[in-house]
Amino acid sequence: QKPSIGKCSVDIQQNRTKTTERPDLLNCPIYWQQVQEKCLLFSHTVNPWNNSLADCSTKESSLLLIQDKDELTRTQNLIHDKAISFWIGLNFSLSEKNWKWINGSFLSSNDLKITGDAKENSCVYISQTSVYSEYCSTEMKWICQKELTLVRNKVSPDSWL
């Protein structure tokens, strides 16, 4: 939930030309959805995993990183069609023979249960109910994430009316 903005104590009539600082806000950019402390963007188009990774970078974000089962469930609750799939920021590292998040950390065995092969060129996607591995060349939707940002808005009191 976004924090509510407290009532302004400024006397608007007496300070009509004065610029006032608004309280700090935790904001997601337009079109992004706030989920806990993250902003998520669900793509409307499809791409292979690498292109999805690159697209998130251009948006100053990353492919979704999921910390635990609770976060997985919260994200899956936003997927409204059982058949639709979204790439996340997890793929198989052949050199380390393990699932690796794009931030460099490895998948902990109790984080996510992945259905499918753990092999070269395997990337992970989520659906409404499950987590799967698939060839990274498969073209699917994807989810970008960015951390909530503090926005300090300087606005004229007129704009509050």
Epitope: V46, I84, S85, Y135, T138
Partner: antibody
């Protein structure tokens, strides 16, 4: 109007070639996996081939591998099937079909053309 | 390749009847299954995807269930326009995407 329209079917001799086309309209063609599915007279359905939205990934049924080639032109909203070395058992109605968007290679065919008949006979 | 066996191959029923068609996969396919309806001379129409999700525009008298190897399509109250042939299809991520042999629903 969202639709698929196949063309290019006809009568061809064994060993001959044919090129089928499928014109898509009413949706963003470049975002969908597309397939060819066929149905021999009085028989069931057989998936033939698919192509990914960008055209980078392609797959074929064993029965047509090495003889058929699927392709697409996203600028023209068109899907193609080049059929070479045709056999009598390739005789069928050939359907162009779109998959539900964003299901990856889990191909649920939610939009079909009316089909075009290919007859291979001497 | 994964084989799909549909039963029965044909069924005679009357308007208002409850009709059940089964589809059995030769190996587990999770919920990667679709059901189609086909009328003579027409293209198939997607009814159910992901084993139980109703495709947009399909009447609610159609329902799907099952996972793993055993799946069911149910028509709760058969209507005149439902007389057709029904096919199941497995859609695991690797081809070939096989179809069942079909079940013809005929008027009794």
């Amino acid at each position: 109007q969202v639709q698929l329209v196949e063309s290019g079917g006809g009568l061809v001799k064994p060993g001959g070639s044919l090129r089928l086309s499928c014109a898509a309209s009413g949706f963003t063609f470049s975002q969908y996996y597309m397939s060819w599915i066929r149905q021999a007279p009085g028989k069931g359905l057989e998936w033939v081939s698919y192509i990914s939205p960008s055209g980078a990934t392609i797959a074929y049924a064993d029965s047509v591998k090495g003889r058929f080639t699927i392709s697409r032109d996203n600028a023209k909203n068109s899907l193609y099937l080049q059929m070479n070395s045709l056999r009598a058992e390739d005789t069928a109605v050939y359907y162009c079909a779109r998959s539900l968007m964003a299901t990856g290679t889990h191909l649920y065919f939610d939009l079909w053309g009316r089909g075009t008949l290919v007859t291979v006979s001497s | 390749d994964i084989q799909l066996t549909q039963s029965p191959s044909s069924v005679s029923a009357s308007v208002g009847d409850r009709v059940t068609i089964t589809c059995r996969a030769s190996q587990g396919i999770s919920s990667w299954l679709a059901w189609y309806q086909q009328k003579p001379g027409k293209a198939p129409k997607l009814l159910i995807y992901a084993a139980e999700s109703l495709q947009s525009g399909v009447p609610s008298r159609f329902s799907g269930s099952g996972s793993g190897t055993d799946f069911t399509l149910t028509i709760s109250s058969l209507q005149p326009e439902d007389f057709a042939t029904y096919y199941c299809q497995q859609v695991t991520s690797q081809p070939p995407y096989t179809f069942g042999g079909g079940t013809k629903v005929e008027i009794k």
